[in-house]
Interface confidence: low
C-alpha cells in the first residue's frame, strides 16, 4: 500500500508533471530508524515502474546516486504521454526469503501545454435562449486542463464560465447562462477562451459577433393548413413563429417524392398561400425561420405536417376498349373496358363510372353507373352505336370519352399484314406489323390487344390493350406478361367507322412442354384413321405450341417411327392419317412442339386397321 508512507518518502525533480521528452530524477529516502533491522548497510532501495497497474520495469540500473542504507536517486527517461506510477521498495538482502517492502510511491504525468483554442462558435437558440459557445481545443494535452470562456460587451457587460478536460471528460463547450435580447441587435460582443494546465497556458484570438450572428430562431410550431373552399390545389399554410422572424423558408413534397418544392416568404407573419398543390395527394410540409433578411442563421426545420389535399373533379381521357360478340341473328353483346385514371388525373377516389351506349340514328340511349372498369350489355345488332365513359369522384366527373362501336375484325382490307411476335425478355413481347395493303379509309389508330390462351380467359379476364399511333408499326407489350404462357395477340386497325384485325400467338419465354397430348380415341372411317386427343393442360404447355406430331410404328418393329406434323390449332382435336397397312397392329403416340423443343411422348395406343390399304 503506497499511500501509507511509513518507511520513507519519494520525491521528483523537477516536478511530478513534465513535458513530453523530458527526464526526471526520482529520490527514495528512508525515514530515521527505518530499514532492515540491525544492518543498515544491507538496506537496498529499488524502484519499480508501473503502467496501467502493470509492472513494466525494474529501474535498478538507473541509479544515479546512492547513500548506502538511507536514500537512492534514479533517473527516468523516455516516459510516454499520460500517467506513470513509480514505487520504491526496500529489499533486505540478508534475508532472501522476505519479499521487498513498499516504502512509498509517486505518479509522474507527462503531457503538453495547451494549444490556443480555435474556431469559436456561439449560438443562442431562440429569443429566450442562453448563449453557448463551442471551440476546438487542439491537440490532447494528457493533463487536466482548465478552460475559461469570457464574454464582454456593451455597458461593461462581462461574464465568464469554466470547465476542465482530463482523461475522463472533454471540455469544448460552455453555456454562459445569459440571454442576449433583440434590443442589443446592433451591439458587438467579444468572446475569448483561455486554456491553462501545469505545463503552460494559451488564449484564443478574440471572436466578435452580434446578436443576429448567433441567435438561431426556434423552429416554427403549430403548423396547419387550410384549404380554400375545400380546394385540392390551393391552401393557406399557417404556423407560429418567434416575434422577430422576418423570413421563412417553406418546403413541401408529396410523400412518395424525392425532391422538395422550396419557397421563400418575407414578412409572412405565420401565413402563406400555396397554389400549385396536387389534389388528393399526401403532402409533407416543413418550415424554417430567420431573424434577418441578409444575416443570421436559419432555424432547424419544423416538425413535419402531413396531410392529404382535398379531392377535385377528375380530368383526363379514359382509355376505352370493347369486345363484340353476336348472340343470335339480331342481338349482340357489347363488353366495354377502360383503364383506371392515374392519380394525377383521378384527383380523388373514383366512386363510379358513368357509362352510356347510344344508337346514333334512332337516338336510343342506355345509361348506367358502375364501380368496375368494365360493363356489358346486350343490344340490337342493327344500327351504329357509340359508347362513352366518364369517371366520377366526390367533386364531380371527368369529360366523357367517346368510342365508336365498329365490327373490330369486319373489314379484311383493314387487316394489318405480316404480324409477328418476338420475345424480348422474360416479361415482354415485341409485336410488329405492316399497314393494311388496300385500306379504303385512313387508319386512325392501331390497338394491340392480348390475353392469355387459357381456358375461360375470355370470360374471366378482361383484355389488355395498347393504343398505337397510326404511323407506328410496333408495340412492346409488357402488362401482365408472364413467362411460359402463350398469349393471343390481335392487332386492330381502326378507321372512323370500320375495323380490321390480324391475330398471332406469342410468348415471352418458352420451354419444351411437360407432356404430350393424350390420345383418347382412334377410329376408322373410309379407309382412314382418325386420331383424337385432348390438349395438354394449360400449365404444362410452357409457351405457345407450334405443332403436334403423331408418331406410329408396327408394334414389334425396331425401325424408326413414321410421323405426321400438324399445325397447332386450338379448335382442332382430331386428325386423319392414311398410310397404315390393314391387319397390322400399330403403336401410336403424340408429342407437342414449342419454339424451345419437343415434349416427351404422350400415352401410347395400339390399333389394328381393318380396311384395305391406300
Amino acid at each position: 500500500n503506497i499511500d501509507v508512507c511509513k518507511l520513507g518518502t519519494v520525491t521528483v525533480q523537477p516536478a511530478p508533471v513534465i513535458p513530453l521528452g523530458s527526464a526526471a530524477n526520482i529520490s527514495c529516502s528512508l525515514n530515521p530508524k527505518q530499514g532492515c533491522s540491525h544492518y543498515p548497510s544491507s538496506n537496498e532501495l529499488i524502484l519499480l515502474k508501473f503502467v496501467n497497474d502493470v509492472l513494466v520495469e525494474n529501474l535498478h540500473g538507473k541509479k544515479v546516486h546512492d547513500h548506502t542504507g538511507h536514500s537512492s536517486t534514479f533517473q527516468v527517461t523516455n516516459l510516454s504521454l499520460g500517467m506513470t506510477l513509480f514505487v520504491c521498495k526496500l529489499n533486505c538482502s540478508n534475508s532472501q526469503k522476505k519479499p521487498p517492502v513498499p516504502v512509498c510511491g509517486v505518479e509522474i504525468s507527462v503531457g503538453v501545454a495547451p494549444e490556443p483554442p480555435q474556431n469559436i462558435s456561439c449560438v443562442q437558440e431562440g429569443e429566450n435562449g442562453t448563449v453557448a459557445c463551442s471551440w476546438n481545443s487542439g491537440k490532447v494535452t494528457y493533463l487536466k486542463t482548465n478552460y475559461t470562456l469570457q464574454l464582454s460587451g456593451p455597458n461593461n457587460l462581462t461574464c465568464q464560465k469554466q470547465c476542465f478536460s482530463d482523461n475522463r471528460q472533454n471540455c469544448n463547450r460552455l453555456d454562459l447562462g445569459i440571454n442576449l435580447s433583440p434590443d442589443l441587435a446592433e451591439s458587438r460582443f467579444i468572446v475569448r477562451v483561455t486554456a491553462i494546465n501545469d505545463l503552460g497556458n494559451s488564449s484564443s484570438l478574440p471572436h466578435t459577433f452580434t446578436f443576429l450572428d448567433i441567435v438561431i430562431p426556434l423552429p416554427p410550431w403549430d403548423i396547419r393548413i387550410n384549404f380554400l373552399n375545400a380546394s385540392g390545389s390551393r391552401g393557406t399554410l399557417q404556423w407560429e413563429d418567434e416575434g422577430q422572424v422576418v423570413l421563412n423558408q417553406l418546403r413541401y413534397q408529396p410523400l412518395n417524392s424525392t425532391s422538395w418544392n422550396m419557397v421563400n416568404a418575407t414578412n409572412a407573419k405565420g401565413k402563406y398561400d400555396l397554389r400549385d398543390l396536387r389534389p388528393f395527394t399526401e403532402y409533407e410540409f416543413q418550415i424554417s425561420s430567420k431573424l434577418h433578411l441578409s444575416g443570421g442563421s436559419w432555424s432547424n426545420w419544423s416538425e413535419s405536417l402531413r396531410t392529404r389535399t382535398p379531392e377535385e373533379e377528375p380530368v383526363g381521357i379514359l382509355d376505352i376498349w370493347y369486345m363484340k360478340q353476336d348472340i343470335d341473328y339480331d342481338r349482340q353483346q357489347i363488353s366495354l373496358f377502360w383503364k383506371s385514371l392515374n392519380p394525377s388525373e383521378a384527383r380523388g377516389k373514383i366512386l363510379h363510372y358513368q357509362v352510356t351506349l347510344q344508337e346514333v340514328t334512332k337516338k336510343t340511349t342506355l345509361q348506367n353507373t358502375t364501380r368496375h372498369t368494365s360493363w356489358t350489355r346486350v343490344i340490337p345488332r342493327t344500327g351504329a352505336w357509340t359508347a362513352s365513359v366518364s369517371a366520377a369522384n366526390s367533386k364531380g366527373a371527368s369529360a366523357p370519352t367517346h368510342i365508336n362501336i365498329v365490327d373490330l375484325c369486319g373489314t379484311g382490307l383493314l387487316a394489318p399484314h405480316q404480324v409477328s411476335a418476338k420475345s424480348e425478355n422474360m416479361d415482354n413481347i415485341l409485336v410488329t406489323w405492316q399497314p393494311p395493303k388496300k385500306a379504303d379509309s385512313a387508319v386512325r389508330e392501331y390497338i394491340v390487344e392480348w390475353r392469355a390462351l387459357q381456358p375461360g380467359s375470355i370470360t374471366k379476364f378482361p383484355p389488355h390493350w395498347l393504343r398505337i399511333p397510326p404511323d407506328n408499326m410496333s408495340a412492346l407489350i409488357s402488362e401482365n406478361i408472364k413467362p411460359y404462357i402463350c398469349y393471343e395477340i390481335r392487332v386492330h386497325a381502326l378507321s372512323e367507322s370500320q375495323g380490321g384485325c390480324s391475330s398471332i400467338r406469342g410468348d415471352s419465354k418458352h420451354k419444351a412442354p411437360v407432356s404430350g397430348p393424350h390420345i383418347t380415341a382412334i377410329t376408322e372411317k373410309k379407309e382412314r384413321l382418325f386420331i383424337s386427343w385432348t390438349h395438354i393442360p394449360f400449365p404444362e404447355q410452357r409457351g405457345c405450341i407450334l405443332h403436334y406430331r403423331i408418331y406410329w410404328k408396327e408394334r414389334d418393329s425396331t425401325a424408326q417411327p413414321e410421323l405426321c406434323e400438324i399445325q397447332y390449332r386450338r379448335s382442332q382435336n382430331s386428325h386423319p392419317i392414311s398410310s397404315l397397312q390393314p391387319r397390322v397392329t400399330y403403336v401410336l403416340w403424340m408429342t407437342a412442339v414449342t419454339a424451345a423443343g419437343e415434349s416427351p411422348q404422350g400415352n401410347e395406343r395400339e390399333f389394328c386397321p381393318q380396311g384395305k390399304a391406300n
Epitope: 390545389s233 400549385d276 396536387r278 380530368v315 383526363g316 381521357i317 379514359l318 382509355d319 385514371l341 392515374n342 394525377s344 388525373e345 371527368s398 389508330e445 393504343r467 399511333p469
Partner: nanobody
Framework: QVQLQESGGGLVQAGMSLRLSCAAS????????MGWFRQAPGKEREFVAG??????QYRDSVKGRFTISRDDAKNTVYLQMNSLKPEDTAVYYC???????????????WGQGTQVTVSS
C-alpha cells in the same frame, strides 16, 4: 394565362444534334401530359414523342434517335434530337394535355413552334 414557349431550333447538318426546350407557365405542370408534334410544309401535323407519367412513346421513325424528358421543378419538357436527317425538317410544337395520348386534338395547349432545318 397558359403559355408554352419552345426554343432550341435552328439549322444543322444531317447527323448533328439539337435539343429543344419547352417552358410552360400558367398551368400546374406536373399534372400535364406533354408531347412534341411536328409539321413539315404541305403535310399534316404529326406526333413525335410524348411523356405520360412513367410511359414515353415515340413515332417509329424517331425511335432510338430522339429522347423526351421533363423537369417538373423547372416546368420544362425537352426533346433531345440526335442523328438528325433531312426528313426531320419541320416546325416542332410542344403541347400539353390532361389526358391525351398521341392524337393532336386531345391536347389542350400549344406553343408557337420552333423551326428545325436539317440540310444534307
Amino acid at each position: 394565362q397558359v403559355q408554352l414557349q419552345e426554343s432550341g431550333g435552328g439549322l444543322v447538318q444531317a447527323g448533328m444534334s439539337l435539343r429543344l426546350s419547352c417552358a410552360a407557365s400558367g398551368l400546374t405542370f406536373s399534372w400535364y401530359r406533354m408531347g412534341w408534334f411536328r409539321q413539315a410544309p404541305g403535310k399534316e401535323r404529326e406526333f413525335v414523342a410524348g411523356w405520360y407519367g412513367v410511359l414515353t412513346q415515340y413515332r417509329d421513325s424517331v425511335k432510338g434517335r430522339f429522347t423526351i424528358s421533363r423537369d417538373d421543378a423547372k416546368n420544362t419538357v425537352y426533346l433531345q434530337m440526335n442523328s438528325l436527317k433531312p426528313e426531320d425538317t419541320a416546325v416542332y410544337y410542344c403541347a400539353a394535355s390532361l389526358g391525351g395520348n398521341y392524337r393532336s386534338y386531345e391536347y389542350d395547349y400549344w406553343g408557337q413552334g420552333t423551326q428545325v432545318t436539317v440540310s444534307s
